[in-house]
């Protein structure tokens, strides 16, 4: 049966800065085809259990699948197909009219970096503990990878890390993000964002843990020296981090231009697309270079801020220079200045 389980099956994820997330295209017969999200009897708004696409993520040398569902922005390449039968089967597909096709999106975890962990092994004179010390980031259900409450485990003991806002811990946070193979530290998360409040019906492993740690050495270079055990606090903050490797990233598109390589910039917040408002923190072309790359266009030719005379013009705002650093977009309900970007078109 011809399906994404076939060992020779080829897929790729396009229209994103990462090879591990984007619009699903498959090689079939004569070339690459975009897969419509209406395939296999699904509706264009339906989200699937992503684990069914684990073979695709694996073949792309990415981690486990995080989401499988409508990509919400459809770029139609030369060809799009709707397939029938079981999910992931390509035995019975037909060409779709491009205006009828909503593309299927897949997000897989970025691959783990193959650099050796920064934790040094304990000196050979000490007995080996039952398990080496390790970290875990616990996100909200359906939350992001590389973002969440930090839990530290040493042997059989595990718990959150007490954190005071005045703690000067930048080096430690970089070390922790790096140890988690999540890149570098971006910012602290408020606990509501990080998902500390637990649903009473949650599985046992996500219930609050019985012990807590305090930062002992913010310049530590091996995990066993970073924290010391304390009595659990009823109140107070716990350490919650956002690292640069967070996923899924903000997606962008260009609309209203004469090709997919020019137009007003829109970004996606959840299932909604909205205009990206101009930001004083992004006056350089870096942000727009990244947007052009995501559309698979060449470098930026020009960008101009459109006048926001209309007090009712709404949109989304990213406070960082690059969209890839934006873990959340803020709503702007008035005077949103849109930006019109023109990228080089690789296929003029």
């Amino acid at each position: 049966r011809l399906s994404w389980y076939d060992p020779d099956f080829q897929a790729r994820l396009t229209r994103s800065n990462s090879k591990c997330q984007g619009q699903l295209e498959v090689y079939l017969k004569d070339g690459w085809h975009m897969v419509c999200s209406q395939s296999w009897g699904r509706s264009s708004k339906q989200w699937e259990d992503p684990s069914q696409a684990s073979k695709v993520c694996q073949r792309l040398n990415c981690g486990v699948p995080l989401s499988l569902g409508p990509f919400l922005v459809t770029y139609t390449p030369q060809s799009s197909i709707i397939c029938y039968g079981q999910l992931g089967s390509f035995s019975n597909c037909s060409h779709s009219r491009n205006d009828m096709c909503h593309s299927l999106g897949l997000t897989c975890l970025e691959p783990q970096k193959t650099t050796p962990p920064t934790t040094r092994p304990p000196p050979t004179t000490t007995p080996e503990p039952t398990a080496p010390p390790r970290l875990q980031l616990v996100a909200q259900s359906g939350g992001q990878h590389c973002a969440g409450v930090v839990e530290f485990y040493s042997g059989s003991l595990g718990g959150t890390i007490s954190y005071e806002a005045q703690d000067k811990t930048q080096d430690l946070e970089n070390f922790l993000c790096n140890n988690l193979q999540c890149g570098s530290f971006l910012k602290h998360l408020p606990e509501t964002e990080a998902g500390r409040a637990q649903d009473p019906g949650e599985p046992r492993e996500h219930q609050p843990l019985p012990i807590q740690w305090k930062i002992q050495n913010s310049s530590c270079t091996s995990l066993e020296h970073c924290f010391r055990k304390i009595k659990p606090q009823k109140s107070g903050r716990v350490l919650a981090l956002l690292c640069s490797g967070f996923q899924p990233k903000v997606q962008s598109r260009l609309v209203g231009g004469s090709s997919i390589c020019e137009g007003t910039v829109e970004v996606r917040q959840g299932a909604q697309w909205a205009a990206l408002c101009d930001s004083s923190s992004a006056r350089s072309s870096l942000r727009w270079e990244e947007v052009c790359r995501e559309q698979q266009c060449g470098s930026v030719n020009s960008y101009r801020v459109l006048d926001a005379g209309d007090p009712t013009s709404r949109g989304l705002f990213c406070p960082h220079q690059k969209l890839s650093q934006c873990h959340e977009l803020w709503e702007r309900n008035s005077y949103c200045k849109k930006v019109f970007v023109t990228c080089q078109d690789p296929n003029p």
């Epitope: 049966r1 011809l2 076939d6 020779d8 090689y27 017969k29 004569d30 690459w32 030369q78 390509f90």
Partner: antibody, heavy 120, light 106 residues
Framework: QVTLKESGPVLVKPTETLTLTCTFS??????????VGWIRQAPGKGLEWVAH???????YYNPSLKSRLTITKDASKDQVSLKLSSVTAADTAVYYC????????????WGQGTLVTVSS | NIVMTQSPSSLSASVGDRVTITCQAS??????VAWYQQKPDQSPKLLIY???TRHTGVPDRFTGSGSGTDFTLTISSLQPEDIATYFC????????FGSGTKLEIK
């Protein structure tokens, strides 16, 4: 094991229609993902893809030959036929029957080829 | 139509030599490239597909690499039975072949 064998006329007159048949074994054109096609090679020259037919009756033709080509299959007989109309001396070549899978694994099995000469 | 420019058109090498044949596509073909070996009076045989995957039974001295527009077939240690003409093939959009490289023993 997979085998493909071409059959058809050795000599065809200009303006006539060339009909070639490929008989294969070791796989079925009813199996999803399977395709059979034709590639030709003029004497002392390179390879030129001609046409392909897939398990689901989808057909693809070389754009430069499309107007003169028809490819059909009879899956129950394990045969694929190619018709090339209005032949000229430029169509003189060894015609190979080839198998290909939809996943893009190249032309993985080839027939021995049959030399067709177009001459009056 | 995508044009595949293959070079050299012929080359002479000694047994044990490392041999490299290149193919350049007129536009980006990703990794949808295959390589074939054709010995005199025989039909071509598939060596490599998807740029670097060896077909069943192909010796590991044959390796393929590249992506986008530039592709290479390498024979790490030339054997007498490798004397043949080699063709590249792109299948990113329809199918086109390189003009061939005739490999001879010095």
């Amino acid at each position: 094991q997979v085998t493909l064998k071409e059959s058809g006329p050795v000599l065809v007159k200009p303006t006539e229609t060339l009909t070639l048949t490929c008989t294969f074994s070791g796989f079925s054109l009813s199996t999803s993902g399977m395709g059979v096609g034709w590639i030709r090679q003029a004497p002392g020259k390179g390879l030129e893809w001609v046409a392909h037919i897939w398990w689901d009756d989808d057909v693809y033709y070389n754009p430069s030959l499309k107007s003169r080509l028809t490819i059909t299959k009879d899956a129950s007989k394990d045969q694929v036929s190619l018709k090339l109309s209005s032949v000229t001396a430029a169509d003189t070549a060894v015609y190979y029957c080839v198998r290909r899978r939809a996943t893009g694994t190249g032309f993985d099995y080839w027939g021995q080829g049959t030399l067709v000469t177009v001459s009056s | 139509n995508i044009v595949m420019t293959q070079s050299p058109s012929s080359l002479s090498a000694s047994v044990g030599d490392r041999v490299t044949i290149t193919c350049q596509a007129s536009q980006d073909v990703g990794t949808a490239v295959a390589w074939y070996q054709q010995k005199p009076d025989q039909s071509p045989k598939l060596l490599i597909y998807w740029t670097s995957t060896r077909h069943t039974g192909v010796p590991d001295r044959f390796t393929g690499s590249g992506s986008g527009t530039d592709f290479t077939l390498t024979i790490s240690s030339l054997q007498p039975e490798d004397i043949a003409t080699y063709f590249c093939h792109q299948y990113n959009s329809y199918n086109t072949f390189g003009s061939g490289t005739k490999l001879e023993i010095k």
